[in-house]
């Protein structure tokens, strides 16, 4: 922590400028007025401070704004943003996409996923919903950042905005996020023809229920294995061998490569071996011929 001292008269600061890079930490703490710093934040990032010195400036801003920085300060944080913790950022109210862009540029390529996720969260809260302009900004300046949002925040995406989302923006989305986004995508693309619809809906299919996957199997979509492997396990298990064959089309041969991986492995275990044999892929692990399958979960539910 920076110790308190009085500022020597010759070191008094009247404006934020490059002379401050020659101040020791103690002198910065004693001589820089926090209100002056806040008023001239737009100058700070152009001055070649060390991060050690930026820590002192952050400390001054924290004291001036214990409830969180105003957006006029946040917008000009520059590399000082790298010193912010998620706890700091949670106190902010951010509504401007210019602020978001500026900070995303600074954090690009750094290990700041927690801070960036919190920042985006604050922007969504500040703007009231995840609107098209926000999504456009995220996809342009932070591919993959959409998936840093919680399912609750993603639920504020209007279906009309889904079209702006690119496949690579969903690469890091988990099942719970895709569960939220898939119904919106289904609604957004509902008026498209079969092949066009499939191209658009494909990145979102990790959130699709069984009935929708079954419906796709009737449309000659020739789903690639990478997409199939991202389907929910619960959506894949009820599919019949014939449905999977129709769903994958020529890509069905890829099942052999993936037979030890979920959801393919789990799906194989639920199929009759003689049905699997009809694929001619040598898939093993199905239910042997002549065995009776009792679904005890149904009986338990009735009792």
């Amino acid at each position: 922590d920076v110790e308190r001292t009085t500022c020597p008269p010759e070191k008094e600061v009247h404006e934020i400028d490059e002379s401050l890079i020659f101040y020791k930490k103690r002198e910065l703490e004693a001589c820089v007025d926090a209100a002056l710093l806040a008023a001239q934040m737009d100058r700070v990032d152009a001055i070649p401070f060390t991060y050690e010195q930026l820590d002192v400036l952050k400390h001054k801003l924290d004291e001036l704004y214990p409830q969180g920085y105003p957006e006029s300060v946040i917008r000009h944080l520059g590399h000082l943003f790298l010193k912010m913790s998620p706890e700091d950022i949670r106190k902010w109210n951010v509504t401007s996409l210019e602020t978001l862009k500026a900070l995303l540029k600074v954090s690009k390529g750094h290990e700041m996923s927690a801070q960036v996720a919190t920042l985006i969260d604050r922007v969504v809260v500040g703007r009231g919903q995840l609107d098209k302009d926000t999504v456009d900004t995220l996809t342009a300046f932070c591919p993959g950042c959409l998936c840093s949002l919680s399912p609750e925040r993603l639920s504020s995406v209007p279906p009309s905005v889904i079209g702006a989302v690119r496949p690579q923006d969903l690469d890091t989305c988990g099942p719970r996020q895709l569960d939220v986004l898939y119904p919106k995508a289904r609604l957004a693309f509902q008026n498209m023809s079969g092949s066009e619809y499939f191209v658009k809906i494909r990145p979102f299919l990790g959130g699709a229920p069984t009935e929708d996957v079954k419906a796709l199997s009737q449309q000659n979509v020739s789903m690639d294995l990478a997409t199939f492997m991202k389907l929910r396990r619960e959506a894949v298990l009820p599919l019949t061998v014939a449905e999977v064959q129709k769903l994958l089309g020529p890509h069905v041969e890829g099942l052999k490569v993936e037979e030890q991986h979920s959801p393919v492995r789990d799906w194989i275990l639920k199929q009759r071996q003689d049905d699997l044999d009809t694929l001619g892929l040598g898939l093993q692990g199905g239910i042997p011929n002549g065995y009776l399958i009792l679904d005890l979960s149904v009986r338990e539910a009735l009792s």
Epitope: P48, F49, T50, Y51, E52, H79, L82, K83, G109, H110, E111
Partner: nanobody, 116 residues
Amino acid sequence: QVQLQESGGGLVQPGGSLRLSCATSGTIFSRNGMGWFRQAPGEQRELVARILNDGTTMYADSVKGRFTISRDNAKNTVLLQMNSLKPEDTAVYYCGYSDYRGTDYWGQGTQVTVSS
């Protein structure tokens, strides 16, 4: 992470000169160029001179006209030519830089003692 190694320090009489060298183990991606800092006993570290990425040089008032910072890109070194040395220049001298990720890097330091 790029290593920094200072050399060239020593004992010198007032009015004398020393040339400090900072060798880097690789290419540095610095947000604020390279700086020479010093720390006297019981004092905090202070910047003495800085050379920015574009070659601009900056000096503390206390060393202006006496110290010169320069860069030899071919040898990956940053130099500090110190002339007209004074007893108050006695300190451990460090070279350092700040990356784009929020971290400052420093060498191990080289001792400069100005005494008769």
